[in-house]
Amino acid sequence: MAVTACQGLGFVVSLIGIAGIIAATCMDQWSTQDLYNNPVTAVFNYQGLWRSCVRESSGFTECRGYFTLLGLPAMLQAVRALMIVGIVLGAIGLLVSIFALKCIRIGSMEDSAKANMTLTSGIMFIVSGLCAIAGVSVFANMLVTNFWMSTANMYTGMGGMVQTVQTRYTFGAALFVGWVAGGLTLIGGVMMCIACRGLAPEETNYKAVSYHASGHSVAYKPGGFKASTGFGSNTKNKKIYDGGARTEDEVQSYPSKHDYV
């Protein structure tokens, strides 16, 4: 029951996390910037991975997509790639985990197969979460370092003059959504991996138990019967179970002093 709950909770947490990663990737507020000393009206600039927007105090908003793929900074491309990889891995992980859920019966799928699928999806969720956290962190680092400010403050451009205005870009809501979502996906993945351990058949559960009828090599000992064919070895000195039942591991390979009367 605990295993099912852990697996189910892991699935739900990962689902929320991946939804958050998708939301963060699509959001425009990755970086935000306020202009306080505006000559006209309060203008609020914000950017996402795909487009840049400006919103005025009047409510007017205008967004434009980034004009070129080749002209974009390598860091931005890397962040896009990390987020997309995170989404793809997470989506595949969700698909796999649906079939792996203990509460869902699909044909005659064995627990061992479900355990493997649960582990696979768990690893995918962990990697997905790490990709999202890495992507958001790289972007945050870009903002902190203000890498574009290395340009000259004023210079003459084609057809006139250009001046770089000193401005600070701050963390947008998407960064926090991304961090939380990545963390949730990571936690969900860990939970799936933990659930996998519970789903995986324990070694002892599947050890064949051999019961042998009393034969020529049966010896009576106080505390119970020990059935043996006289072959195999009990090198592990394991307890001989009352009632004459023991596992394949405990089959003796050499006759012991008790085997012959």
């Epitope: 970086s31 910037q33 006209v40 840049s52 870009m142 903002l143 870009y169």
Partner: nanobody, 121 residues
Amino acid sequence: QVQLVESGGGLVQPGGSLRLSCAASGNILSINYMGWYRQAPGKERELVALITRGGTTNYAESLKGRFTISGDNAKDTVYLQMNSLQPEDTAVYYCYFRINFGILGGLRDYWGQGTQVTVSS
């Protein structure tokens, strides 16, 4: 790279009108402001008028009522309609754009090369 192309300047008689236009082209992202500055001989460059994409305007106090700024967001073009021109309006008029490139290059102010407006009889 952003280019600003101004047009409409010239010689006009006092009391006359002129319409300046400035078109921005190139890799333009978020335009915060479009507008006009002017610089008369031997004087500092001064603000004439600014307009936001949403249509909010700001004029130099001395020019209110005579000058009208407008913009065409689809064409990234700003216009300045100048009426009742006086000799003191003689100056080089510079087109101005403040463009936000965000993470791609910060906030930048662009000025055109300027167009000469001469008011004389």
